[in-house]
Amino acid sequence: FERTRSLQDPCSNCPAGTFCDNNRNQICSPCPPNSFSSAGGQRTCDICRQCKGVFRTRKECSSTSNAECDCTPGFHCLGAGCSMCEQDCKQGQELTKKGCKDCCFGTFNDQKRGICRPWTNCSLDGKSVLVNGTKERDVVCGPSPADLSPGASSVTPPAPAREPGHSPQ
């Protein structure tokens, strides 16, 4: 079986880390420096990814696998396989076309990436604000005001509907 397969497709004999060159006697040759083949039986090796500039090397390229990049401090990965690096902002900020901007009142961002999101509207769940929100932190909702008054009924009437996204004043 091995010999039959070899005769049918000589390139099937070449492992990962090599390329198949039918123009020479020894058809399986190791990938040239700075290239790789992850499957074998390939006619060419792929050029290794180079992690330059804002990218830094997380895993070196080998003859059988591509390099993997991440981002230098102050940046974070975006896209499949860290195809882009985006600038970090501070907590309480979001990245805009003009750079990092503070979150508007009523919004927060607790990470160094992503956008500012509205504070939770506690009253939509019939609750009250226990801890006020900041640019870096969401509000903390507590029990409904009715739950806090003595002798209150255990059933809280539904809160009036409000537009989502509005922050408790």
Epitope: P10, P15, A16, T18, Q26, I27, P30, A39, S63
Partner: antibody, heavy 120, light 113 residues
Framework: QAQLQQSGPELVRPGTSVKMSCKTS????????MHWMKQRPGQGLEWIGM????????RLNQKFKDKATLNVDKSSNTAYMDFSSLTSEDSAVYYC?????????????WGQGTLVTVSA | DIVMTQSPSSLTVTAGEKVTVSCKSS????????????LTWYQQKPGQPPKLLIY???TRESGVPDHFTGSGSGTDFTLTISSVQAEDLAVYYC?????????FGGGTKLEIK
């Protein structure tokens, strides 16, 4: 039938270099990578590196990167290995060798070996 | 680098006995693309260069007696000599033929009683 004929034994001083040869016949010299192996007396085999005679592309075992230099002379179908800064640890039999057919399919053709003795 | 570990390092047997030599690699030698294991076995007799016995883990080189068999996959491989003969006295080596540096096992010395 592929044949690999290696140069004769060498008695050399510590700190010096030695150049051994491997003359090939019976096959296309530039068609196959040439391997070099080391075997100390009574010990196992170590792969030193390999060279593609068609373009002198070389792959060296990191352990030997400051020790071995591989080259070829296409006009005489001969491969060479220079071994430098010799110590007693370099006393060994050195083999040149070639893969069987496709490559990565076993080393089927071997020279008879060159015995290098490093002694003051 | 891939580390190849052979066992036993030596064994003494009577002619006609069955012998198994084990070889373990620190990384898989199985190429997923073609489901082939790049593991080679050699026989070396005193004063001679090694001789290729088996390549791709189980393919016997032409001219090698059929009492030599290779098996295994991934990281665990075995060389079996079904009925040892006097001329099998030698050292047997396994080798990673998958990726350079093409490392060898430490060898198994076979002696005949």
């Amino acid at each position: 039938q592929a044949q690999l004929q290696q140069s004769g034994p060498e008695l050399v001083r510590p700190g010096t270099s030695v150049k051994m040869s491997c003359k090939t016949s019976g096959y296309s010299f530039t068609g196959y990578w040439m391997h070099w192996m080391k075997q100390r007396p009574g010990q196992g085999l170590e792969w030193i590196g390999m060279i593609d005679p068609s373009n002198s592309d070389t792959r060296l075992n990191q352990k030997f990167k400051d020790k071995a230099t591989l080259n070829v002379d296409k006009s005489s179908n001969t491969a060479y290995m220079d071994f430098s800064s010799l110590t007693s640890e370099d006393s060994a039999v050195y083999y040149c060798a070639r893969w069987r057919y496709y490559g990565y399919d076993g080393i089927a053709y071997w020279g008879q070996g060159t015995l290098v003795t490093v002694s003051a | 680098d891939i580390v190849m570990t052979q066992s036993p390092s030596s064994l003494t047997v009577t002619a006609g006995e069955k012998v198994t030599v084990s070889c373990k690699s620190s990384q898989s030698l199985l190429n997923s693309g073609n489901q082939r294991n790049y593991l080679t076995w050699y026989q070396q007799k005193p004063g001679q260069p090694p001789k290729l016995l088996i390549y791709w883990a189980s393919t016997r080189e032409s001219g090698v007696p059929d009492h030599f068999t290779g098996s295994g996959s991934g990281t665990d491989f075995t060389l079996t000599i079904s009925s040892v003969q006097a001329e099998d006295l030698a050292v047997y080596y396994c080798q990673n033929d998958y990726t350079y540096p093409f490392t060898f096992g430490g060898g198994t010395k076979l002696e005949i009683k």
